[in-house]
């Protein structure tokens, strides 16, 4: 906390400009009006303030807005955002996607910090659901964002938002998350034709039930082994050798390389040896 001292004569700030970098911390506190700072926040980022000086500026804003900053200030925080605590951010009401983008840009290239996580949580809760534009923005900055959400949080994602999801956005999702996302994807892509549908649904298939896999096996989709390995064990076990052969098409030979790994191992174990022999891969049940 900076002590209250009178501003030296002639040093009262008329605007936020580069001359302020030569002010000591106590001079910034005494000579910069908080209301002026709030209206000229967009200038702060262009000025090479030290971390200590930024602390003073934050303190002034905190005094001016004890209940939380207005969005007009939040949007122009820039690097001052890095000084905010999750507790500060919980007081905010961020509704503009432009504000969210501006703050995410400040943290770009870094892992999601507790501040960013709190900001996103506040924003999404304020909107009531993860709409497509928000999801587009968040996954662009944090490809793993979707998989950081709980199954309960994912349930608020409308099917229309699924169009924004890229395969890499699902890389770190666990089975419970895919269980929630798959039905939404199925709904979102339902009007697409066979081959186009498979391209879109492929990365969500870790949540698919047996009956959907059986249906896909009738459509000559040629599923690759990487996708097959991510399928739910309980969905794979009831599939017949013929169905798996149709599902994988030319990729069926890859089963041999994965015979010691789940879910291939579980599936092999539950097949009749005579049926496995028809594949000609030397798989032992």
């Amino acid at each position: 906390e900076v002590e209250k001292t009178a501003c030296p004569s002639g040093k009262k700030a008329r605007e936020i400009d580069e001359s302020l970098i030569f002010y000591k911390k106590w001079e910034l506190e005494a000579c910069v009006d908080a209301a002026l700072l709030a209206t000229q926040m967009d200038r702060v980022n262009a000025i090479p303030f030290t971390y200590e000086q930024l602390d003073v500026l934050k303190h002034k804003l905190d005094e001016l807005y004890p209940q939380g900053y207005p969005e007009s200030v939040i949007q122009h925080l820039g690097y001052l955002f890095l000084k905010m605590s999750p507790e500060d951010i919980r007081k905010w009401n961020v509704t503009s996607l432009e504000t969210l983008k501006a703050l995410l840009e400040v943290n770009k290239g870094h892992e999601m910090s507790p501040q960013v996580a709190t900001l996103i949580d506040r924003f999404v809760k304020g909107r009531g659901q993860l709409d497509k534009d928000t999801l587009d923005t968040l996954t662009a900055f944090y490809p793993g964002y979707l998989c950081s959400l709980s199954p309960e949080e994912l349930s608020s994602v409308p099917p229309s938002s699924i169009w924004a999801v890229r395969p890499q956005d699902l890389d770190t999702c666990d089975p419970r998350q895919l269980d929630v996302l798959y039905p939404k994807a199925r709904l979102a892509f339902q009007n697409m034709n066979g081959s186009e549908y498979f391209v879109k649904i492929q990365s969500f298939l870790g949540g698919a039930p047996t009956e959907d896999l059986k249906a896909l096996s009738q459509q000559n989709v040629s599923m690759d082994l990487a996708t097959f390995m991510k399928l739910r064990t309980d969905a794979v076990l009831p599939l017949t050798v013929a169905e798996v052969q149709k599902l994988l098409g030319p990729h069926v030979e890859g089963l041999k390389a994965e015979e010691r790994h789940r879910p291939v191992r579980d599936w092999i174990l539950r097949q009749r040896q005579d049926d496995l022999d028809t594949l000609g891969l030397g798989l032992q049940g």
Partner: antibody, heavy 119, light 107 residues
Framework: QVQLQESGPGLVKPSETLSLTCTVS??????????WSWIRQPPGKGLEWIGY???????NYNPSLKSRVTISVDTSKNQFSLKLSSVTAADTAVYYC???????????WGQGTMVTVSS | DIQMTQSPSSLSASVGDRVTITCRAS??????LNWYQQKPGKAPKLLIY???SLQSGVPSRFSGSGSGTDFTLTISSLQPEDFATYYC?????????FGGGTKVEIK
């Protein structure tokens, strides 16, 4: 509710064969989703998986023990058994039988039986 | 074989503490990771399966996360009955392996 119970001698001489049986009650050893494992734990040490069997008779063993291990199943008695040959003092451990549901993990365990290898 | 490395090997904590145990696989095991709790003289008990799914009857203060090679077991608020040894186990590869265990002791 499924329960497992290990039985067999608590003392085995070095170079002999350790034999244990696990009796399954309240369920069937012929379950489609389940495999049946043996797991051991030397005194004061961690857990080591020995191997499993499926009701069809298919087995899968720990490579480090494979040459000495045989696991078999008797569906008529609802039992599965472990034989470990050429035992040494290093095989002294608590031996557990366990059910593995393919969809979860080792969800049901026997209470364990202590086997000491000593002359 | 896939090696499973747990850390720490032991920790001291108080009732009410948040406790985190990590498990690292020597290669990717997808989400085929289970967590067990074992008390002295007792058989292990399944807590978490498939990395993050809570086994039926296990209190919700236990949670699991992770995929690939890095996994975490978290106890949100340690209770007196939680002082025990915890093991991770991979079931992705046919040769199942357990972590070395983490003993959670009273501070």
């Amino acid at each position: 509710q499924v329960q497992l119970q290990e039985s067999g001698p608590g003392l085995v001489k070095p170079s002999e064969t350790l034999s244990l049986t696990c009796t399954v009650s309240g369920g069937s050893v012929s379950s489609f989703t389940d495999t049946w494992s043996w797991i051991r734990q030397p005194p004061g040490k961690g857990l080591e998986w020995i191997g499993y069997i499926y009701y069809s008779g298919s087995t899968n063993y720990n490579p480090s023990l494979k040459s000495r291990v045989t696991i078999s199943v008797d569906t008529s008695k609802n039992q599965f058994s472990l034989k470990l040959s050429s035992v040494t003092a290093a095989d002294t451990a608590v031996y557990y039988c366990a059910r593995e549901d393919a969809l979860t993990g080792f969800d049901i365990w026997g209470q364990g039986t202590m086997v000491t290898v000593s002359s | 074989d896939i090696q499973m490395t747990q850390s720490p090997s032991s920790l001291s904590a108080s009732v009410g503490d948040r406790v985190t145990i990590t498990c690292r696989a020597s290669q990717s095991i997808s989400s085929y990771l289970n967590w067990y709790q074992q008390k002295p003289g007792k058989a292990p008990k399944l807590l978490i399966y498939a990395a993050s799914s809570l086994q039926s009857g296990v209190p919700s203060r236990f949670s699991g996360s992770g995929s690939g090679t890095d996994f975490t077991l978290t106890i949100s608020s340690l209770q007196p009955e939680d002082f025990a040894t915890y093991y991770c186990q991979q079931s992705y590869d046919a040769s199942y392996t357990f972590g070395g265990g983490t003993k959670v002791e009273i501070k």
